[in-house]
């Protein structure tokens, strides 16, 4: 059980107030984290509160401003990047968001040696991506879908690719589906460790069907947004990987890296690229049917100036019970010998663990094991491996950082974070300096987040980087809800849940229940993290009980739970929410006539199906930007879990699992359907089809659209959205306004 800062004295109670919706919408109780921008083993940069860029040296204790806020302001810079030789800084301004990760911006190069902006051969605008080489001050950037290289910031650019074309050919940046569902980055180019080579992906979207939607704007006629977007079963992008020698880029030009034969025999994806040395690179490929992944280690052949990927250096990862990997196939972390590596994949018991691969995957040495999962490998040094897992005290929703020794006697495994601030901190991430000389720990909760700096050798805390004192003080007179994390055992399935309870919760009373659901494959909602958000307000002020449940299909509890939903999305996720609700009713403090469910995106899909389950459990519910049919969603994501929508594959379940097929069942619930009209991710089409099916079935429902808003419903739409949903729930639960 996680209890928020205790409020024991009744005399204090009258000075305390509940959370308001305004608190949430204004972000009054948001927290800060501190991630050092490491530039060496013992130095980092940080943007101060007054916008100076400050360099900190941990060992000398000194700090100095390398770039003043005045310089930043002169070009309205919102971001910066220091070149590794520390001679130049790029300043980023005119940020213009595109999709989830991508944006365009204007870049200025500032010369630190003379305190002036570099004039001559200025960068074009807007640029889609720009980065320094890992050594020196070479620049690679993407402009109008082509890649350019500068040996020095003031030099004229060398154009590497020439075939880039909007919505057709993408060089060095991903197309929509690769950005969202495969790479999870705005870039698709990678410098070799010393900047000798530059690898990049080329995505050919020529044959991909286009999603088109109106953007209303302010003009007389709406614009049409066109995005090559492969839906399930549609033609996919064609990907090629090239590497160019950046020292003599014109000498032989870009060289294509061969695709493993077993991958190239049918539709495939490129999933990631990892440089090992300047002359060794590791590529990961995935069959379109995403249960086979191949990791290919390629070497530069000086004599031919080509990249050779011998079959002996191909490592196959295959899943027989689901898809390959978790959400993504994990990436390797190479050892100092530049051939062996560490990687997370399922062990024989179906738990994701760290393995050490020296020659073949079959001979992999399992480094961690148990009925828990290794989640991320942060860093491998010559004597330590740092990773995170949810092993500690068997709570899957926690994250602690561990260190395993390599080559020291005796070997040791140590939990670095488990006992640091045990009540306050149970969910950590970490950021390491070069050679893991120092690291920052960022604790996300369950208490107020705190960021600390540590010695990488001894693990001693050096200083607090951010402890959110202002937030702590602001919360002193707030009646926060109580939170508890527990589990239900049902038919050999463990359902972890988080329950958010009103401050004066009394088990003998009856409370309305709101289920907040996401439930997508490899997601996790029940986490030991701090949050003061809309559901906190609903518990604090409106007296609701809110529950989040991780059912089948969710992550970090083993493959049995994770892969249970394989090829049948929309079945068990919904069943498990319903099962949990029944268990909550049995607890005795839930008013079974006042139960609601809400979710966003995948959660909107699950909440819709739960409302249409015919159980009579739910009085009302809300779906925000829901998927309504898997035929409408992106190929890479959908097919990973569902296979193909073809007769000889899984078309039947594609058809059976739509929200529209259950339109009739919405008759006895109050349904609020919400969507942004400019949703590039879950297209408005999804809600349009739900609405059409409900109308055709003559079922009454409520709806709200947000004009020109995407999947995030940001800005003023956020305020409107949460206000609207609050009114809907209060009406449903017969709570006075």
């Amino acid at each position: 059980i996680v209890l928020r800062p205790s409020r024991v004295h009744n005399s204090e109670e009258n000075t305390m107030r509940a959370l308001t919706l305004k608190d949430i919408l204004n972000g009054t109780f948001s927290y800060k984290t501190f991630f050092p921008n490491w530039i060496s083993g013992q130095e980092y940069l940080h943007q101060s509160a007054d916008n100076n860029i400050v360099l900190y040296n941990i060992e000398t204790g000194q700090s100095y401003t390398i770039l003043s806020n005045r310089t930043m302001k002169s070009v309205n810079a919102s971001n910066y990047g220091l070149s590794p030789d520390r001679q130049f800084v790029y300043l980023e301004s005119d940020y213009s968001k595109l999709w989830r990760y991508s944006y365009t911006a204007t870049y200025y190069i500032y010369d630190l040696s003379n305190g002036e902006f570099v004039r001559g051969n200025e960068l074009p605008r807007p640029i889609q991506y720009l980065c320094w080489s890992p050594v020196g001050s070479k620049l690679a950037y993407v402009y109008q879908n082509n890649i350019y290289l500068k040996q020095r910031p003031g030099d004229p650019p060398f154009q590497i690719t020439f075939n880039g074309r909007e919505n057709k050919i993408f060089n060095g940046i991903p197309d929509w589906v690769y950005e969202e569902e495969m790479l999870a980055t705005k870039y698709a180019l990678w410098w070799s460790p010393n900047g000798k080579f530059l690898a990049y992906a080329e995505f050919n979207d020529t044959d991909i069907p286009v999603i088109a939607y109106s953007y209303y704007g302010d003009e007389q006629y709406p614009r049409t947004i066109n995005i090559p977007y492969p839906k399930a079963g549609a033609k996919n992008p064609v990907v090629r990987i090239f590497i160019i020698d950046t020292t003599y880029p014109a000498y032989v030009g870009p060289q294509e890296v061969p695709v493993p034969a077993m991958i190239a025999s049918s539709d495939y994806y490129f999933s990631w690229l990892t440089w090992v040395t300047d002359e060794r690179v590791c590529l990961q490929w995935l069959k379109r049917v995403q249960n086979v992944s191949v990791l290919s280690i390629c070497d530069f052949r000086e004599d031919w100036q080509t990249w050779d990927c011998p079959k002996t250096q191909e490592h196959i990862e295959e899943s027989r019970t689901g898809w390959a990997g978790g959400f993504f196939v994990s990436t390797p972390v190479f050892s100092y010998d530049a051939i062996s590596y560490y990687k997370i994949f399922s062990d024989k018991d179906g738990y994701k663990h760290i393995h050490y691969i020296k020659d073949t995957v079959e001979n992999a040495i399992q480094i961690t094991s148990g009925k828990w999962e290794a989640i991320n490998i942060f860093r491998v040094t010559q004597d330590s491996l740092f990773y995170s897992s949810n092993e500690f005290e068997e709570y899957p929703g926690r994250r602690n950082i561990y260190r395993i020794s390599i080559g020291s006697y005796p070997p040791s495994k140590k939990c670095v974070t488990c006992h640091l601030r045990k009540e306050r901190c149970q969910y950590y991430t970490a950021s390491f300096s070069d050679y893991a000389k120092y690291y920052a720990l960022v604790c996300y909760g369950p208490g107020i987040p705190i960021s600390t700096l540590h010695d990488g050798r001894t693990d001693q805390e050096i200083k607090i980087l951010e402890e959110n004192k202002e937030l702590e003080n602001a919360l002193k007179n707030i009646q926060l809800p109580k939170e508890e994390i527990k589990k239900l055992e049902v038919d050999e399935i463990t359902l972890w849940y988080k329950m958010i309870l009103p401050p004066q919760f009394d088990r003998s009373k009856k409370y309305p229940l709101l289920i907040q659901v996401y439930g997508g494959p490899c997601s996790q909602s029940v986490r030991s993290v701090f949050a003061v958000n809309w559901i906190s307000y609903l518990a604090s002020k409106e007296g609701m009980v809110i529950a989040l449940v991780d059912g089948r299909g969710t992550a970090f509890q083993g493959d049995k739970l994770l892969y249970a939903v394989y090829r049948k999305l929309g079945v068990y996720e919904v069943e498990d929410q319903i099962t949990a609700v029944r268990k909550f009713i049995e607890m005795g403090f839930i008013d079974e006539k006042r139960i609601a469910i809400w979710g966003w995106s995948y959660g909107g899909y699950v909440s819709s199906l739960a409302l249409a389950s015919g159980t009579g459990l739910f009085k009302c519910g809300i779906a925000v930007a829901p998927v309504s049919s898997w035929e409408y969603y992106a190929s890479v994501y959908t097919e990973r879990f569902m296979g193909l929508p073809t007769k000889d594959d899984n078309l039947e379940h594609y058809k059976n699992s739509t929200v529209m097929a259950r339109a009739e069942y919405f008759r006895n619930v109050d349904y609020l359907l919400i969507h942004g009209t400019a949703d590039d991710n879950v297209h408005f089409q999804n809600s349009a089809q739900i609405a059409k099916a409900l109308v055709n079935a003559q079922v009454d429902f409520q709806a709200m659209w947000y004009s020109d808003q995407n999947h995030g419903l940001s800005g003023l739409s956020t305020n409107h959205l949460y206000t609207h949903m609050t009114h809907f729930l209060k009406q449903c639960f017969s709570l006075s306004d």
């Epitope: 040495i365 480094i367 491996l385 390599i406 006697y409 070997p411």
Partner: antibody, heavy 121, light 107 residues
Framework: EVQLLESGGGLVQPGGSLRLSCAAS????????MSWVRQAPGKGLEWVSG????????YYADSVKGRFTISRDNSKNTLYLQMNSLRAEDTAVYYC??????????????WGQGTLVTVSS | DIQMTQSPSSLSASVGDRVTITCRAS??????LNWYQQKPGKAPKLLIY???SLQSGVPSRFSGSGSGTDFTLTISSLQPEDFATYYC?????????FGQGTKLEIK
């Protein structure tokens, strides 16, 4: 070729002392941790003590702690086990073993032929 | 200390047989388990490390599996030179305990 050659075993009275040596060749001695493992007559194997490559860290089984001392001389490529306050139950063949690592774990990849220590009055 | 229990303590088998020896740890030891072979009057010899990795020079008829608490050593087709005593050993935490041994004899 890796070779480990133990010496110094023999008959000793209870309460007495003995010093075992292990001469190593065929590998970079200072780069590897080393260990002593013993086997009582007709019985199984028992780990006794271990030492890091530099000699800076030493470890002992509870049964010998405070009585035995492991050490090494990297300039002579030699491992030692100083055994004091010997008891009858210390009677065993003592093996010197080279330790190799994999991440988080170790194994004894090379063993000497063993030297017999008999503690008896 | 972590206890290592081998079973059976002894077994009789014929040349060509497939033989399995099991080793159980008193607590989870991940994959930090090694297997050794010892012939009478000789020093032990490493067969398998890290539960399933074959030491170089060891015939491929030897294989290891398992993680956590339960481990097995399998000899796919017994050869005359394989009759010996086999020990498992954990390297998860000090002291690095061995199993009591399994004596493999000719039937």
């Amino acid at each position: 070729e890796v070779q480990l050659l133990e010496s110094g075993g023999g008959l000793v009275q209870p309460g007495g002392s003995l010093r075992l040596s292990c001469a190593a060749s065929g590998f970079t001695f200072s780069s590897y941790a080393m260990s002593w493992v013993r086997q009582a007559p007709g019985k199984g194997l028992e780990w006794v003590s271990g030492i890091s490559g530099s000699g800076g860290s030493t470890y002992y089984a509870d049964s010998v702690k405070g009585r035995f001392t492991i050490s090494r001389d990297n300039s002579k490529n030699t491992l030692y086990l100083q055994m004091n306050s010997l008891r009858a139950e210390d009677t065993a063949v003592y093996y010197c073993a080279k330790i190799s690592f994999y991440p988080g774990g170790t194994y004894f990849d090379y063993w000497g032929q063993g030297t017999l220590v008999t503690v008896s009055s | 200390d972590i206890q290592m229990t081998q079973s059976p303590s002894s077994l009789s088998a014929s040349v060509g047989d497939r033989v399995t020896i099991t080793c159980r740890a008193s607590q989870s030891i991940s994959s930090y388990l090694n297997w050794y072979q010892q012939k009478p009057g000789k020093a032990p010899k490493l067969l398998i490390y890290a539960a399933s990795s074959l030491q170089s020079g060891v015939p491929s008829r030897f294989s290891g599996s398992g993680s956590g608490t339960d481990f097995t050593l399998t000899i796919s087709s017994l050869q005359p030179e394989d009759f010996a005593t086999y020990y498992c050993q954990q390297s998860y935490s000090s002291p690095y305990t061995f199993g009591q041994g399994t004596k493999l004899e000719i039937k």
